[in-house]
Amino acid sequence: IWELKKDVYVVELDWYPDAPGEMVVLTCDTPEEDGITWTLDQSSEVLGSGKTLTIQVKEFGDAGQYTCHKGGEVLSHSLLLLHKKEDGIWSTDILKDQKEPKNKTFLRCEAKNYSGRFTCWWLTTISTDLTFSVKSSRGSSDPQGVTCGAATLSAERVRGDNKEYEYSVECQEDSACPAAEESLPIEVMVDAVHKLKYENYTSSFFIRDIIKPDPPKNLQLKPLKNSRQVEVSWEYPDTWSTPHSYFSLTFCVQVQGKSKREKKDRVFTDKTSATVICRKNASISVRAQDRYYSSSWSEWASVPCS
Amino acid sequence: RNLPVATPDPGMFPCLHHSQNLLRAVSNMLQKARQTLEFYPCTSEEIDHEDITKDKTSTVEACLPLELTKNESCLNSRETSFITNGSCLASRKTSFMMALCLSSIYEDLKMYQVEFKTMNAKLLMDPKRQIFLDQNMLAVIDELMQALNFNSETVPQKSSLEEPDFYKTKIKLCILLHAFRIRAVTIDRVMSYLNAS
């Protein structure tokens, strides 16, 4: 058993049929010695008396808020949560496996630049009685500070018969140098509590590996005289690290109709302009990627050919 | 020791070209190592990230773009910083700092060159003959060093008398390649910045 936060405790259980469970001793936080009784949740049934209560925790029915009273007055609470371990593996029932970039990916994180700010998100089908708490650091043995905000519900989607909820959190490394060469990864830890179930999820990464620039901005077209060719120009996104001559991007320019299966014109360039062939009912799209360290491409920025 | 916005040395462009070749060569070599050594811990997640140049050179700091010298976090590890009060730096100081930066890059290359050559000598003794260093990568390191045109003492190639542990050597190769790729990215960024300045 360990303390998650004040008056909230996590009991780690090996979860299999007829498991013996864990013996837990609760102590009432009071100077009083006599006349103390214990109850669980809203029930008025007295579970025991005395300053300590020993219980055998085997299942979710044994978890919950234990309260010690004296003469009708509440003295203190202890909330017990369960963390299940099945076949030596901690349960991952609360969050959905995003399976990208690999199986057992519950947390996904992205950074728009090298400033040390990044966003992580996760998915669940659970809509109520759900709380998250996020901690992060650079390295684990001698951790350096990363400050994370509160996790918030950022999107709701319908997937078949199910609703899916996306939560996200923003974090900022306390003292980040954009030009630094990372040797210790960022660690992100998410505590998830659903009703009386506790689970924790972790992700470890270098900022350089989770870079995904914003799309290029200010796309403009200039038709070339006596030609079907069009000069398309754009600018670096505002959120990208500066100076741009140090943090350079490379671009992919594509002309394509509405369907992905349609024919297309595609060219890669390090410049902020390119010449392509425009077709009726097609769009010109441009996306960006770090020129020197190939992490993710940005989303497309698009303008219609006409 | 930060890079100011300065008139580029006319000989900078060949360095940019060589640094692009360097990044390409080390990236290819790293990819080859990850494929060939698939049953060894050779991915970014599996290895310890060591920097053989730590405390010996200070390329990131010496080559910091002027725009980043206002960032306290970039100056943390530096004993000296050449920020002046708002105005541009005198050209003498400019070329002095650029020289500091480029000589730091040169020293990095020299250290990695020695490590790689020593390692290759060990890998050539491996009866499995599983992996060797790409001669192209070693040649590209050499070309960039020549383009930088610094004279410095030759570092003797380390020779060891004991029987090499090939498993450890291959893991060391992965560690070295990952670190060198990261440094090659920095070098490429620096050359691009200098070329544009």
Epitope: R228, R261, E262, K263, D265, R266, V267, F268, T269, R279 | -
Partner: antibody, heavy 118, light 107 residues
Framework: QVQLVQSGAEVKKPGSSVKVSCKAS????????LHWVRQAPGQGLEWMGW????????EYAPKFQGRVTITADESTSTAYMELSSLRSEDTAVYYC???????????WGQGTLVTVSS | DIVMTQSPLSLPVTPGEPASISCRAS??????LHWYQQKPGQAPRQLIA???QSISGVPSRFSGSGSGTDFTLTISSLQPEDFATYYC?????????FGQGTKVEIK
């Protein structure tokens, strides 16, 4: 299976014209760009131009501008390349080729040998 | 026009050995570079798109690398069926241009 079948070999006199055809099967004809590339005996590949069969748009290499005409007939899924004012150095195998991507080629025809000789 | 220069023009290789062909562009073309293989009496066949993207159906022993002006096609272990002429082609700008070809011959 995508296939491009070209017309047979031709022998032409200098100053005349040649029209080579290329019939496509497998896939929708207008879903692809069609290119013409030639190869002189023992020489390398030389790009001549492309056509978008959907709208008839064409682009020619400056070297052939004014001498080459690429057309397409959607009803028969056939593309044509006509080269005029032939000279001996136009002796080559002429390939039609196609791709959904404009700037490179993934499927080639078998080639048509055009010999220009007096 | 962008001029593509291949080297060597002829490359004698022992079967089972690796081979590398170089292609250089007269100006920077990013990764807009494609590789083709041509056997005598046959049409070319696509091997690599955009400098390093493998094409389905092409054996994994063929790989490409490079960007800017310098590109390489590598065959990790030459098989008897790989003896052919190899061409690079730039797609950075029109007109599309090819290298002059590299003939890989049995040593």
């Amino acid at each position: 299976q995508v296939q491009l079948v070209q017309s047979g070999a031709e022998v032409k006199k200098p100053g005349s014209s040649v029209k080579v055809s290329c019939k496509a099967s497998g896939g929708t004809f207008s879903d692809y760009y069609l290119h013409w590339v030639r190869q002189a005996p023992g020489q390398g590949l030389e790009w001549m131009g492309w056509i978008d069969p959907e709208n008839g748009d064409t682009e020619y290499a400056p070297k052939f501008q004014g001498r080459v005409t690429i057309t397409a007939d959607e009803s028969t899924s056939t593309a044509y390349m006509e080269l005029s004012s032939l000279r001996s150095e136009d002796t080559a195998v002429y390939y039609c080729a196609r791709n959904k991507e404009l700037r490179y080629i993934d499927v080639w025809g078998q080639g048509t040998l055009v010999t220009v000789s007096s | 026009d962008i001029v593509m220069t291949q080297s060597p023009l002829s490359l004698p290789v022992t079967p089972g050995e690796p081979a590398s062909i170089s292609c250089r562009a007269s100006q920077s073309i990013s990764i807009n570079l494609h590789w083709y293989q041509q056997k005598p009496g046959q049409a070319p066949r696509q091997l690599i798109a955009f400098a390093s993207q493998s094409i389905s159906g092409v054996p994994s022993r063929f790989s490409g690398s490079g960007s800017g002006t310098d590109f390489t096609l590598t065959i990790s272990s030459l098989q008897p069926e790989d003896f052919a002429t190899y061409y690079c082609q730039q797609s950075n700008s029109f007109p599309l241009t090819f290298g002059q070809g590299t003939k890989v011959e049995i040593k």
